[in-house]
Protein backbone atom coordinates (compact mmCIF):
# COMPACT_ATOMS: atom_id res chain seq x y z
CA UNK A 1 0.00 0.00 0.00
CA UNK A 2 1.25 3.49 -0.80
CA UNK A 3 -0.05 7.04 -0.49
CA UNK A 4 -1.16 8.68 -3.75
CA UNK A 5 -2.01 11.95 -2.02
CA UNK A 6 -3.20 12.99 1.40
CA UNK A 7 -5.66 10.41 2.78
CA UNK A 8 -5.75 8.51 -0.54
CA UNK A 9 -3.99 5.14 -0.66
CA UNK A 10 -3.38 2.63 -3.43
CA UNK A 11 -3.51 -1.07 -2.65
CA UNK A 12 -1.59 -3.15 -5.19
CA UNK A 13 -3.57 -6.33 -5.70
CA UNK A 14 -2.26 -9.41 -7.48
CA UNK A 15 -5.70 -10.76 -8.38
CA UNK A 16 -6.89 -14.24 -9.29
CA UNK A 17 -10.23 -15.85 -8.37
CA UNK A 18 -9.21 -17.37 -5.02
CA UNK A 19 -6.44 -14.93 -4.17
CA UNK A 20 -6.11 -14.25 -0.44
CA UNK A 21 -5.87 -10.52 -1.10
CA UNK A 22 -3.77 -7.94 0.71
CA UNK A 23 -3.92 -7.33 4.43
CA UNK A 24 -4.16 -3.60 5.10
CA UNK A 25 -3.93 -1.87 8.48
CA UNK A 26 -5.66 1.52 8.67
CA UNK A 27 -4.79 3.91 11.48
CA UNK A 28 -7.15 6.63 12.66
CA UNK A 29 -5.44 10.03 12.51
CA UNK A 30 -6.35 11.18 16.02
CA UNK A 31 -4.80 11.46 19.48
CA UNK A 32 -7.90 9.67 20.80
CA UNK A 33 -7.42 6.08 21.94
CA UNK A 34 -10.82 4.81 23.03
CA UNK A 35 -14.37 4.65 21.66
CA UNK A 36 -13.30 4.71 17.99
CA UNK A 37 -15.43 2.91 15.38
CA UNK A 38 -14.96 2.37 11.65
CA UNK A 39 -17.38 2.48 8.70
CA UNK A 40 -17.07 2.18 4.91
CA UNK A 41 -18.53 4.77 2.52
CA UNK A 42 -22.13 5.75 3.36
CA UNK A 43 -22.87 2.56 5.28
CA UNK A 44 -23.61 2.83 9.00
CA UNK A 45 -22.46 -0.78 9.58
CA UNK A 46 -19.61 -0.79 12.09
CA UNK A 47 -16.64 -2.72 10.67
CA UNK A 48 -14.49 -2.64 13.77
CA UNK A 49 -13.41 -0.61 16.76
CA UNK A 50 -10.13 0.76 18.02
CA UNK A 51 -7.48 3.08 16.68
CA UNK A 52 -6.50 0.63 13.95
CA UNK A 53 -8.63 -1.44 11.58
CA UNK A 54 -7.22 -4.50 9.81
CA UNK A 55 -8.95 -5.47 6.56
CA UNK A 56 -8.36 -8.08 3.89
CA UNK A 57 -8.61 -6.40 0.47
CA UNK A 58 -9.61 -9.01 -2.13
CA UNK A 59 -11.68 -7.03 -4.64
CA UNK A 60 -13.21 -3.62 -5.40
CA UNK A 61 -15.98 -4.33 -2.89
CA UNK A 62 -13.33 -3.89 -0.18
CA UNK A 63 -12.16 -0.52 -1.52
CA UNK A 64 -13.70 2.86 -0.76
CA UNK A 65 -13.65 5.53 1.90
CA UNK A 66 -12.98 4.18 5.39
CA UNK A 67 -13.94 6.58 8.16
CA UNK A 68 -13.14 6.47 11.86
CA UNK A 69 -15.60 8.10 14.25
CA UNK A 70 -15.99 8.82 17.95
CA UNK A 71 -19.34 9.67 19.44
CA UNK A 72 -20.88 10.66 16.12
CA UNK A 73 -17.91 12.87 15.17
CA UNK A 74 -15.74 12.07 12.14
CA UNK A 75 -12.07 11.80 13.10
CA UNK A 76 -10.37 10.94 9.80
CA UNK A 77 -10.84 9.34 6.38
CA UNK A 78 -8.75 6.95 4.30
CA UNK A 79 -9.76 6.39 0.69
CA UNK A 80 -8.53 3.02 -0.61
CA UNK A 81 -8.10 2.57 -4.35
CA UNK A 82 -7.09 -0.66 -6.06
CA UNK A 83 -4.31 -1.12 -8.60
CA UNK A 84 -5.00 -4.55 -10.02
CA UNK A 85 -2.53 -6.96 -11.54
CA UNK A 86 -3.86 -10.04 -13.36
CA UNK A 87 -1.61 -12.72 -14.87
CA UNK A 88 1.38 -10.53 -14.02
CA UNK A 89 0.03 -7.54 -16.00
CA UNK A 90 -1.20 -4.29 -14.45
CA UNK A 91 -4.69 -3.40 -15.66
CA UNK A 92 -5.08 -0.88 -18.48
CA UNK A 93 -8.87 -0.59 -18.53
CA UNK A 94 -9.24 3.17 -18.27
CA UNK A 95 -7.43 4.27 -21.45
CA UNK A 96 -7.91 3.02 -24.98
CA UNK A 97 -5.02 1.44 -26.84
CA UNK A 98 -4.41 3.86 -29.74
CA UNK A 99 -2.40 1.14 -31.55
CA UNK A 100 -0.30 3.85 -33.24
CA UNK A 101 2.63 3.63 -33.83
CA UNK A 102 2.43 0.20 -32.15
CA UNK A 103 0.14 -1.89 -29.93
CA UNK A 104 -0.17 -0.89 -26.27
CA UNK A 105 0.25 2.80 -27.10
CA UNK A 106 -1.95 4.56 -24.55
CA UNK A 107 -0.21 7.95 -24.52
CA UNK A 108 0.77 9.85 -27.65
CA UNK A 109 2.92 12.95 -27.60
CA UNK A 110 3.94 15.58 -30.16
CA UNK A 111 6.11 18.69 -30.22
CA UNK A 112 5.80 21.53 -32.75
CA UNK A 113 9.45 22.53 -32.30
CA UNK A 114 12.59 21.99 -30.19
CA UNK A 115 11.69 24.44 -27.40
CA UNK A 116 11.03 21.65 -24.89
CA UNK A 117 7.27 22.19 -25.05
CA UNK A 118 5.16 19.17 -25.98
CA UNK A 119 1.57 17.94 -25.83
CA UNK A 120 0.42 14.44 -24.88
CA UNK A 121 -3.04 13.03 -25.34
CA UNK A 122 -4.98 9.85 -24.62
CA UNK A 123 -8.43 8.38 -25.25
CA UNK A 124 -11.10 6.84 -23.04
CA UNK A 125 -14.73 5.79 -23.36
CA UNK A 126 -15.37 6.77 -19.72
CA UNK A 127 -17.28 10.00 -19.16
CA UNK A 128 -17.63 10.34 -15.37
CA UNK A 129 -15.81 9.78 -12.06
CA UNK A 130 -12.48 10.15 -13.81
CA UNK A 131 -9.37 12.07 -12.79
CA UNK A 132 -5.87 12.33 -14.27
CA UNK A 133 -2.61 13.58 -12.86
CA UNK A 134 0.48 14.04 -15.03
CA UNK A 135 4.15 14.16 -14.05
CA UNK A 136 7.17 14.36 -16.29
CA UNK A 137 10.95 14.56 -16.13
CA UNK A 138 13.99 14.19 -18.34
CA UNK A 139 15.67 10.99 -17.28
CA UNK A 140 14.60 8.88 -14.31
CA UNK A 141 17.66 8.21 -12.15
CA UNK A 142 18.67 11.89 -11.75
CA UNK A 143 15.53 13.53 -13.15
CA UNK A 144 15.57 17.04 -14.59
CA UNK A 145 12.43 19.12 -14.30
CA UNK A 146 9.53 19.16 -16.71
CA UNK A 147 6.39 21.08 -15.73
CA UNK A 148 2.99 19.80 -16.88
CA UNK A 149 -0.34 21.55 -16.64
CA UNK A 150 -3.65 19.95 -15.76
CA UNK A 151 -5.08 17.38 -18.13
CA UNK A 152 -8.20 18.69 -19.86
CA UNK A 153 -10.94 17.19 -22.00
CA UNK A 154 -9.90 18.33 -25.49
CA UNK A 155 -12.34 16.49 -27.81
CA UNK A 156 -15.40 14.25 -27.88
CA UNK A 157 -16.11 11.92 -30.80
CA UNK A 158 -18.84 9.46 -31.62
CA UNK A 159 -17.54 6.14 -32.94
CA UNK A 160 -20.39 3.83 -33.88
CA UNK A 161 -22.52 3.35 -30.76
CA UNK A 162 -19.69 4.60 -28.59
CA UNK A 163 -18.55 7.99 -27.38
CA UNK A 164 -14.82 8.56 -27.13
CA UNK A 165 -13.20 11.28 -25.03
CA UNK A 166 -9.78 12.75 -25.73
CA UNK A 167 -7.78 14.31 -22.91
CA UNK A 168 -4.61 16.28 -23.39
CA UNK A 169 -1.89 17.95 -21.37
CA UNK A 170 0.84 20.45 -22.19
CA UNK A 171 4.30 20.11 -20.67
CA UNK A 172 7.42 22.29 -20.79
CA UNK A 173 10.95 21.26 -20.02
CA UNK A 174 12.22 23.69 -17.37
CA UNK A 175 15.73 24.18 -18.77
CA UNK A 176 15.37 23.22 -22.42
CA UNK A 177 18.30 23.57 -24.77
CA UNK A 178 16.83 23.39 -28.30
CA UNK A 179 20.14 22.91 -30.11
CA UNK A 180 21.53 20.25 -27.76
CA UNK A 181 21.77 16.57 -28.68
CA UNK A 182 19.38 14.67 -26.38
CA UNK A 183 20.96 11.80 -24.47
CA UNK A 184 18.26 11.19 -21.83
CA UNK A 185 14.64 10.68 -22.81
CA UNK A 186 11.64 12.59 -21.52
CA UNK A 187 9.51 10.40 -19.23
CA UNK A 188 5.78 11.09 -18.94
CA UNK A 189 3.71 9.42 -16.21
CA UNK A 190 -0.09 9.63 -16.06
CA UNK A 191 -2.00 8.53 -12.97
CA UNK A 192 -5.59 7.66 -13.85
CA UNK A 193 -8.34 7.11 -11.29
CA UNK A 194 -11.80 5.90 -12.27
CA UNK A 195 -14.16 5.33 -9.37
CA UNK A 196 -12.02 3.10 -7.09
CA UNK A 197 -9.62 1.92 -9.79
CA UNK A 198 -6.08 3.28 -10.03
CA UNK A 199 -3.93 2.78 -13.12
CA UNK A 200 -0.71 4.35 -14.32
CA UNK A 201 0.56 4.84 -17.84
CA UNK A 202 4.00 5.90 -19.01
CA UNK A 203 5.68 7.07 -22.18
CA UNK A 204 9.35 7.66 -22.88
CA UNK A 205 10.69 9.61 -25.86
CA UNK A 206 13.21 12.09 -27.21
CA UNK A 207 11.78 15.42 -28.36
CA UNK A 208 13.44 14.87 -31.75
CA UNK A 209 11.31 11.73 -32.27
CA UNK A 210 7.98 13.41 -31.55
CA UNK A 211 8.54 16.52 -33.66
CA UNK A 212 5.63 17.33 -35.96
CA UNK A 213 5.84 20.83 -37.45
CA UNK A 214 2.74 22.91 -37.99
CA UNK A 215 1.75 23.19 -41.68
CA UNK A 216 3.54 25.79 -43.80
CA UNK A 217 1.83 29.19 -43.67
CA UNK A 218 0.90 31.80 -46.29
CA UNK A 219 0.60 29.28 -49.11
CA UNK A 220 0.20 31.28 -52.34
CA UNK A 221 0.02 30.65 -56.10
CA UNK A 222 1.46 32.93 -58.76
CA UNK A 223 0.58 31.97 -62.37
CA UNK A 224 3.51 32.09 -64.79
CA UNK A 225 2.84 33.99 -68.03
CA UNK A 226 1.86 31.96 -71.10
CA UNK A 227 2.10 28.73 -69.17
CA UNK A 228 0.05 26.15 -67.26
CA UNK A 229 2.72 26.35 -64.60
CA UNK A 230 2.37 28.21 -61.33
CA UNK A 231 4.87 29.25 -58.75
CA UNK A 232 3.83 28.02 -55.32
CA UNK A 233 5.32 29.82 -52.35
CA UNK A 234 4.95 29.45 -48.59
CA UNK A 235 6.65 30.30 -45.33
CA UNK A 236 7.91 28.42 -42.30
CA UNK A 237 5.17 28.06 -39.64
CA UNK A 238 5.35 30.61 -36.83
CA UNK A 239 5.72 27.86 -34.24
CA UNK A 240 8.89 26.38 -35.78
CA UNK A 241 12.22 26.82 -34.00
CA UNK A 242 14.53 29.65 -35.02
CA UNK A 243 16.91 30.45 -36.60
CA UNK A 244 15.62 28.65 -39.69
CA UNK A 245 19.15 28.46 -41.04
CA UNK A 246 19.90 26.03 -38.21
CA UNK A 247 16.45 24.50 -37.63
CA UNK A 248 15.72 23.82 -41.28
CA UNK A 249 12.68 22.21 -42.85
CA UNK A 250 12.21 20.28 -46.05
CA UNK A 251 8.93 20.36 -47.95
CA UNK A 252 6.71 18.13 -50.06
CA UNK A 253 4.54 19.81 -52.71
CA UNK A 254 1.63 17.79 -54.07
CA UNK A 255 -0.80 18.44 -56.93
CA UNK A 256 -3.97 16.43 -56.36
CA UNK A 257 -6.90 16.17 -58.76
CA UNK A 258 -10.50 16.27 -57.60
CA UNK A 259 -10.72 12.48 -57.68
CA UNK A 260 -8.64 10.62 -55.11
CA UNK A 261 -7.81 8.06 -57.84
CA UNK A 262 -6.08 10.62 -60.03
CA UNK A 263 -2.31 10.42 -60.05
CA UNK A 264 -0.64 12.76 -57.56
CA UNK A 265 2.35 14.78 -58.70
CA UNK A 266 4.87 15.29 -55.90
CA UNK A 267 7.94 17.51 -55.66
CA UNK A 268 10.38 17.61 -52.73
CA UNK A 269 12.33 20.76 -52.02
CA UNK A 270 14.30 22.53 -49.30
CA UNK A 271 13.24 25.92 -50.67
CA UNK A 272 10.06 27.80 -49.81
CA UNK A 273 8.79 27.84 -53.38
CA UNK A 274 8.34 25.46 -56.28
CA UNK A 275 7.04 25.50 -59.82
CA UNK A 276 4.31 22.98 -60.66
CA UNK A 277 1.63 22.39 -63.29
CA UNK A 278 -1.78 23.38 -62.03
CA UNK A 279 -4.52 21.18 -63.49
CA UNK A 280 -8.16 22.27 -63.63
CA UNK A 281 -10.08 21.43 -60.42
CA UNK A 282 -6.86 20.29 -58.76
CA UNK A 283 -5.48 21.56 -55.47
CA UNK A 284 -1.91 22.19 -54.37
CA UNK A 285 -0.79 21.06 -50.94
CA UNK A 286 2.47 21.55 -49.07
CA UNK A 287 3.71 19.88 -45.91
CA UNK A 288 6.92 20.18 -43.88
CA UNK A 289 9.38 17.90 -42.11
CA UNK A 290 12.59 18.47 -40.18
CA UNK A 291 15.29 18.57 -42.85
CA UNK A 292 17.92 16.63 -40.94
CA UNK A 293 15.87 14.17 -38.89
CA UNK A 294 13.03 12.03 -40.20
CA UNK A 295 10.32 12.70 -37.65
CA UNK A 296 6.66 13.24 -38.63
CA UNK A 297 5.49 15.30 -41.56
CA UNK A 298 3.19 18.20 -40.78
CA UNK A 299 -0.44 18.19 -41.86
CA UNK A 300 -1.01 19.58 -45.37
CA UNK A 301 -1.61 23.25 -46.14
CA UNK A 302 -3.76 23.45 -49.30
CA UNK A 303 -5.01 25.93 -51.90
CA UNK A 304 -7.23 25.30 -54.96
CA UNK A 305 -5.64 25.65 -58.40
CA UNK A 306 -8.40 27.90 -59.67
Amino acid sequence: IWELKKDVYVVELDWYPDAPGEMVVLTCDTPEEDGITWTLDQSSEVLGSGKTLTIQVKEFGDAGQYTCHKGGEVLSHSLLLLHKKEDGIWSTDILKDQKEPKNKTFLRCEAKNYSGRFTCWWLTTISTDLTFSVKSSRGSSDPQGVTCGAATLSAERVRGDNKEYEYSVECQEDSACPAAEESLPIEVMVDAVHKLKYENYTSSFFIRDIIKPDPPKNLQLKPLKNSRQVEVSWEYPDTWSTPHSYFSLTFCVQVQGKSKREKKDRVFTDKTSATVICRKNASISVRAQDRYYSSSWSEWASVPCS
Epitope: F60, G61, T125, D161, N162, K163, H194, L196
Partner: nanobody
Framework: EVQPVESGGGVVQAGESLRLSCAAS????????MGWFRQAPGTEREFVAT????????YYADSVKGRFTISRDNAKNTVYLQMSSLKSEDTAVYYC????????????????WGQGTQVTVSS
Protein backbone atom coordinates in the same frame (compact mmCIF):
# COMPACT_ATOMS: atom_id res chain seq x y z
CA GLU B 1 -25.21 3.92 -21.28
CA VAL B 2 -26.06 0.25 -21.50
CA GLN B 3 -29.49 -1.18 -20.71
CA PRO B 4 -29.55 -4.81 -19.49
CA VAL B 5 -32.65 -6.96 -20.09
CA GLU B 6 -32.82 -10.40 -18.41
CA SER B 7 -34.67 -13.47 -19.70
CA GLY B 8 -34.78 -17.22 -19.14
CA GLY B 9 -36.26 -17.38 -15.63
CA GLY B 10 -38.88 -19.91 -14.68
CA VAL B 11 -39.92 -22.70 -12.35
CA VAL B 12 -37.69 -25.79 -12.09
CA GLN B 13 -37.28 -28.78 -9.81
CA ALA B 14 -34.39 -29.02 -7.35
CA GLY B 15 -31.33 -30.53 -9.03
CA GLU B 16 -32.30 -29.25 -12.48
CA SER B 17 -30.57 -26.64 -14.64
CA LEU B 18 -31.54 -23.27 -16.11
CA ARG B 19 -29.77 -20.73 -18.27
CA LEU B 20 -30.40 -17.02 -17.83
CA SER B 21 -29.54 -14.51 -20.56
CA CYS B 22 -28.98 -10.78 -20.33
CA ALA B 23 -29.05 -8.77 -23.55
CA ALA B 24 -27.60 -5.30 -23.25
CA SER B 25 -28.55 -2.51 -25.62
CA UNK B 26 -26.99 0.93 -25.88
CA UNK B 27 -23.34 1.81 -25.58
CA UNK B 28 -20.52 -0.53 -26.37
CA UNK B 29 -21.23 -3.67 -24.35
CA UNK B 30 -17.60 -4.78 -24.38
CA UNK B 31 -16.60 -1.71 -22.33
CA UNK B 32 -18.43 -3.08 -19.31
CA UNK B 33 -17.78 -5.62 -16.62
CA MET B 34 -21.01 -7.62 -16.18
CA GLY B 35 -22.46 -9.23 -13.08
CA TRP B 36 -25.40 -11.24 -11.79
CA PHE B 37 -27.06 -10.56 -8.44
CA ARG B 38 -30.14 -12.07 -6.83
CA GLN B 39 -32.70 -11.05 -4.26
CA ALA B 40 -35.00 -13.35 -2.35
CA PRO B 41 -38.08 -11.86 -0.63
CA GLY B 42 -37.21 -9.98 2.55
CA THR B 43 -33.45 -10.13 1.97
CA GLU B 44 -30.80 -7.79 0.57
CA ARG B 45 -29.55 -8.09 -2.99
CA GLU B 46 -26.82 -10.74 -3.05
CA PHE B 47 -23.84 -11.10 -5.37
CA VAL B 48 -23.81 -14.21 -7.59
CA ALA B 49 -21.08 -13.87 -10.23
CA THR B 50 -19.20 -11.38 -12.39
CA UNK B 51 -17.19 -11.51 -15.62
CA UNK B 52 -14.64 -9.07 -16.98
CA UNK B 53 -15.11 -7.14 -20.21
CA UNK B 54 -13.09 -9.54 -22.35
CA UNK B 55 -14.70 -12.64 -20.88
CA UNK B 56 -11.31 -13.97 -19.80
CA UNK B 57 -11.84 -13.84 -16.04
CA UNK B 58 -14.73 -14.75 -13.72
CA TYR B 59 -15.51 -14.43 -10.01
CA TYR B 60 -18.23 -16.22 -8.02
CA ALA B 61 -19.96 -16.09 -4.67
CA ASP B 62 -18.98 -19.08 -2.52
CA SER B 63 -22.62 -20.20 -2.41
CA VAL B 64 -22.72 -20.85 -6.20
CA LYS B 65 -19.12 -21.83 -6.93
CA GLY B 66 -18.94 -25.07 -8.91
CA ARG B 67 -22.67 -24.96 -9.75
CA PHE B 68 -23.08 -21.71 -11.70
CA THR B 69 -21.08 -20.51 -14.72
CA ILE B 70 -21.06 -16.95 -16.02
CA SER B 71 -20.05 -16.30 -19.64
CA ARG B 72 -20.47 -13.62 -22.27
CA ASP B 73 -20.63 -13.18 -26.03
CA ASN B 74 -19.52 -9.67 -26.93
CA ALA B 75 -20.55 -10.16 -30.57
CA LYS B 76 -24.13 -10.72 -29.36
CA ASN B 77 -24.02 -8.14 -26.53
CA THR B 78 -25.16 -10.89 -24.16
CA VAL B 79 -24.07 -12.32 -20.83
CA TYR B 80 -25.26 -15.72 -19.58
CA LEU B 81 -25.65 -17.46 -16.25
CA GLN B 82 -25.73 -21.24 -16.53
CA MET B 83 -27.21 -22.61 -13.30
CA SER B 84 -27.05 -26.33 -12.50
CA SER B 85 -27.77 -28.49 -9.44
CA LEU B 86 -30.31 -25.88 -8.40
CA LYS B 87 -31.45 -25.78 -4.78
CA SER B 88 -34.54 -24.26 -3.18
CA GLU B 89 -32.32 -21.54 -1.65
CA ASP B 90 -31.49 -20.36 -5.19
CA THR B 91 -35.08 -19.11 -5.50
CA ALA B 92 -34.90 -15.35 -6.11
CA VAL B 93 -35.25 -12.58 -8.63
CA TYR B 94 -32.00 -12.56 -10.66
CA TYR B 95 -30.64 -9.21 -11.83
CA CYS B 96 -28.08 -8.47 -14.50
CA UNK B 97 -25.83 -5.46 -13.94
CA UNK B 98 -23.15 -3.56 -15.85
CA UNK B 99 -20.30 -1.61 -14.30
CA UNK B 100 -16.69 -0.54 -14.58
CA UNK B 101 -15.04 -2.32 -11.65
CA UNK B 102 -13.95 -5.94 -11.86
CA UNK B 103 -14.04 -7.91 -9.67
CA UNK B 104 -16.64 -6.53 -7.30
CA UNK B 105 -19.30 -8.28 -5.25
CA UNK B 106 -20.76 -4.95 -4.10
CA UNK B 107 -23.97 -3.89 -5.82
CA UNK B 108 -23.21 -0.16 -5.70
CA UNK B 109 -20.15 -0.72 -7.89
CA UNK B 110 -22.52 -1.47 -10.80
CA UNK B 111 -24.08 1.44 -12.66
CA UNK B 112 -26.79 -0.10 -14.85
CA TRP B 113 -29.38 -2.69 -13.83
CA GLY B 114 -32.02 -4.80 -15.49
CA GLN B 115 -35.55 -5.31 -14.16
CA GLY B 116 -34.85 -8.89 -13.07
CA THR B 117 -36.16 -12.37 -13.93
CA GLN B 118 -37.79 -14.71 -11.41
CA VAL B 119 -36.25 -18.13 -10.74
CA THR B 120 -38.23 -20.51 -8.57
CA VAL B 121 -36.74 -23.84 -7.49
CA SER B 122 -39.36 -26.20 -6.07
CA SER B 123 -38.43 -29.20 -3.96
Amino acid sequence: EVQPVESGGGVVQAGESLRLSCAASGRSFSDYEMGWFRQAPGTEREFVATINRRGSSTYYADSVKGRFTISRDNAKNTVYLQMSSLKSEDTAVYYCAAGWLYPSSRSRDYDYWGQGTQVTVSS
